[in-house]
């Protein structure tokens, strides 16, 4: 069976995941025999999950991160907060605004010359054999003088979309985030009714490509809310 593959970018023209609601965490929400919808995947449990507004950074916008609104506040209550600008304090990369990353507790520009060379060998194996990463730990080893701008290919682990090659975005895949293809015209997309409503998806789809938007497929206007098919369509 397709099992939990349903919400993968690669699957075209299949019903989207159900709304943003998945019943009780860990329960199977299925609309067709043998198919388990993301969010109701039988392998998943969601611990400490706050349905709204967020549980993890990727549920927030590109200029936001997910955290407790008060310092030292209840870890169970998290909302999407505005990203931190350069030179502001941080604890992880997602806290920093696009174009920056967290190094030694401070948001610094990722386009500085030393960015690719100085950061420790981890994230994605996606950067080829020279494979630098986005972790804020210095390698303290000398690298050759060539620039490290290789981006993650499809299937590579990533932290944000800027880690991925052109035509790919960084999206949730079970408990990790990997580079997936940006959606093309006619491909099924996920239209979130409200911010944070995609927290239950175990797969995230990428956004629609340039010149496309995620809209209800014309012949699905009459369908019920939960089964309306959204696809990437020309503006």
């Amino acid at each position: 069976t397709l099992n939990s593959v349903l919400n993968s970018n690669a699957i075209k023209n299949l019903p989207p995941p159900l709304g943003g609601a998945a019943g009780h965490p860990g329960s199977a929400v299925s609309a067709a025999p043998g198919i388990l919808y993301p969010g109701g995947n039988k392998y998943q449990t969601i611990d400490n999950y706050q349905p709204y507004p967020c549980a993890e950074d990727e549920e927030c916008g590109t200029d936001e991160y997910c955290a407790s609104p008060t310092r030292g506040g209840d870890a169970g209550v998290q909302i999407c907060l505005a990203c931190r600008k350069r030179r502001k304090r941080c604890m992880r990369h997602a806290m920093c605004c696009p174009g920056n990353y967290c190094k030694n507790g401070i948001c610094v520009s990722s386009d500085q010359n030393h960015f690719r060379g100085e950061i420790e060998e981890t994230i994605t194996e996606s950067f080829g054999n020279d494979h630098s990463t986005l972790d804020g730990y210095s390698r303290r080893t000398t690298l050759s003088s060539k620039m490290y701008h290789t981006k993650g290919q499809e299937g590579s682990v990533c932290l944000r979309s800027s880690d991925c090659a052109s035509g790919l975005c960084c999206a949730r895949h079970f408990w990790s985030k990997i580079c997936k293809p940006v959606l093309k015209e006619g491909q099924v997309c996920t239209k979130h009714r409200r911010k944070g409503s995609h927290g239950l998806e175990i797969f995230q789809r990428c956004y629609c490509g340039e010149g496309l938007s995620c809209r209800i497929q014309k012949d699905h206007h009459q369908a019920s809310n939960s089964s309306r098919l959204h696809t990437c369509q020309r503006h």
Partner: antibody, heavy 115, light 108 residues
């Protein structure tokens, strides 16, 4: 460099419990999902469980669901696997590894379930 | 569940020879979400290839991965003495994550 060190394995009777730990260093722990994989003696690899970077999302293989609990303490850079109601077939070397394709592995800790 | 079948079970070759290992999925993976690992006796596995064809950090260029859909291949262009080990493929397209049963590359 990235290091993962498991501990907590040992001999336990059927029905007993064990808690495995995996101490991580050399990378920003809370940026990464983590995975437990096991290998029975002389056998192949079997995925056991996975957990997202914040710990909000956890996943289990059918063979351990309801008996094992994966968790993490990001302030301690440590991953855990609480194993309850252990069975003989849970006997294996348990590895912690980073991400969904396992780019770094610990050395493993042996869990033996036997009476 | 996606079953990964590796062939052959054992490959007997000499140093310098080319090794071709196959991994066949019971379902189309749609995306290149396949990894290859090397494991030597008494050691943890080591990632070689991810995303079907991307070499991991520090992995020599003689290792290459290819394939899509249901058929994937790991090629070792010229075997070195240290390459004799067991090789596993793993899919991360869907849950449960599954591994192949392994191919043992032994010295002829």
């Amino acid at each position: 460099q990235v290091q993962l060190v498991e501990s907590g394995g040992g001999l336990v009777q059927p029905g007993g419990s064990l808690r495995l730990s995996c101490a991580a260093s050399g990378f920003t722990f809370n940026n990464y999902g983590m995975t437990w994989v096991r290998q029975a003696p002389g056998k192949g690899l079997e995925w056991v469980s996975g957990i997202s970077g914040s710990g909000s999302y956890t996943y289990y293989a059918d063979s351990v669901k309801g008996r094992f609990t994966i968790s993490r303490d990001n302030s301690k850079n440590t991953l855990y696997l609480q194993m309850n109601s252990l069975r003989a077939e849970d006997t294996a070397v348990y590895y912690c590894a980073r991400t969904i394709y396992m780019d770094y592995w610990g050395q493993g800790t042996l869990v033996t379930v036997s009476s | 569940d996606i079953v990964l079948t590796q062939s052959p079970a054992t490959l007997s070759l000499s140093p310098g020879e080319r090794a071709t290992l196959s991994c066949r999925a019971s379902q189309n993976l749609f995306s290149p979400y396949l990894a290859w690992y090397q494991q030597k006796p008494g050691q943890a596995p080591r990632l070689l290839i991810y995303g079907a064809s991307n070499r991991a950090t520090g992995v020599p260029a003689r290792f290459s991965g290819s394939g899509s859909g249901t058929d994937f291949t790991l090629t070792i262009s010229s075997l070195e003495p240290e390459d004799f080990a067991v090789y596993y493929c793993q899919q991360y397209m869907t849950l449960p994550l599954t591994f192949g049963q392994g191919t043992k590359v032994e010295i002829k």
